[in-house]
């Protein structure tokens, strides 16, 4: 079952997700998607990073923490009831079936 996070309409929502880079600046690709994590990657991607930077994002979704240190927690700005649901954070650690995936449930009141 998913860990539940709450936010109020009009506020910012925070969905935590972290990993420890093998070395400072040695980043791994991360994707955030609306909906549970599929078998690979993310569905309905709202934001993604590559080995260097945030390389895809949609409006209202951003990383507030220091993603270069592995803080890839998602902030959703000015939430509405439509933002309720499951979100997937997938950390794509290189190798054979090494992904770490987290399904987080956002409840908007």
């Amino acid at each position: 079952s998913e860990v539940e996070y709450r936010a109020e309409v009009g506020q910012n929502a925070y969905l935590p997700c972290f990993y420890t880079p093998a070395a400072p600046g040695n980043l791994v690709p991360v994707c955030w998607g609306k909906g549970a994590c599929p078998v690979f990657e993310c569905g309905n991607v709202v934001l993604r990073t590559d080995e260097r930077d945030v390389n895809y994002w949609t409006s209202r979704y951003w990383l507030n923490g220091d993603f270069r240190k592995g803080d890839v927690s998602l902030t959703i700005e000015n939430v509405t009831l439509a933002d309720s649901g499951i979100y997937c954070c997938r950390i794509q650690i290189p190798g054979i079936m090494n992904d770490e995936k987290f399904n987080l449930k956002l409840v908007i009141k």
């Epitope: 998607g33 599929p38 078998v39 993310c42 991607v45 993604r48 794509q92 190798g95």
Partner: antibody, heavy 121, light 107 residues
């Protein structure tokens, strides 16, 4: 036009090895995940392996993970499947397929024509 | 592994009919279901992803529905070119798995 062309199939002895290739054209190969899927003589489809666009992340079916190796050469627009310790269960038509992922993961939106692998005792 | 139980195995139809194929997942798969069409001697062709979204170029007579564990592919106004085998697949969790197929034949 998107094209995927498999090659390298054939008749191989039990315990033998084979390397399949899939030449891609008509799209930016390095921007897609790629997969191998096989179809048994009974027409059942079975996912075999998937590789990320950069080649950094790899996923296998449990029954092949110690025997098969998926790889790609983005400079040559080519996907590979190295198969070893082949057994009768590996007899199938092997398809390569393209997996879009960037804004939404979608499995196998284009398939090649397939290459046949027959394992004989 | 998630088992996709597809029914029926065979279906006889006439041009103009409406037919439905169902797939039942052994575990919850959200809407991570795709449908493929395979004509004899050809490779599979994608029809539907995310349970209900048609791929580009797929005629509107093909409709996917369902979520959770129960999914349906409906072909309304069947055409002769629709005579083929249809497969569902789940892509919710590893390994990605397919149904055993439904062969659509002419009566």
């Amino acid at each position: 036009e998107v094209m995927l062309m498999e090659s390298g199939g054939g008749l191989v002895k039990l315990g033998g090895s084979l390397k399949l290739s899939c030449a891609a054209s008509g799209f930016t190969f390095s921007s897609y995940y790629m997969s191998w899927v096989r179809q048994t003589p009974e027409k059942r489809l079975e996912w075999v392996a998937t590789i990320s666009n950069s080649g950094g992340s790899i996923y296998y079916l449990d029954s092949v993970k110690d025997r098969f190796t998926i790889s790609r050469d983005n400079a040559k627009n080519t996907l590979y499947l190295q198969m070893s310790s082949l057994n009768s269960e590996d007899t199938a038509v092997y398809y390569c397929a393209r997996d879009p992922y960037y804004s939404n993961y979608v499995p196998m939106d284009y398939w090649g024509q397939g290459t046949s692998v027959t394992v004989s005792s | 592994s998630i088992v996709m139980t597809q029914t029926p195995k065979f279906m006889s139809t006439s041009v103009g009919d409406r037919v439905s194929v169902t797939c039942k997942a052994s575990q919850y798969v959200d809407t991570y279901v795709a449908w493929y069409q395979q004509k004899p001697g050809q490779s599979p062709k994608p029809l539907i992803y995310s349970a209900s979204t048609r791929h580009t170029g797929v005629p509107a007579r093909f409709t996917g529905s369902g979520s959770g564990t129960d999914f349906t592919l409906t072909i309304s106004n069947v055409q002769s070119e629709d005579l083929a085998e249809y497969f569902c697949a789940q892509y919710s969790s590893s390994p990605l798995t397919f149904g055993a197929g439904t062969k659509l034949e002419l009566k």
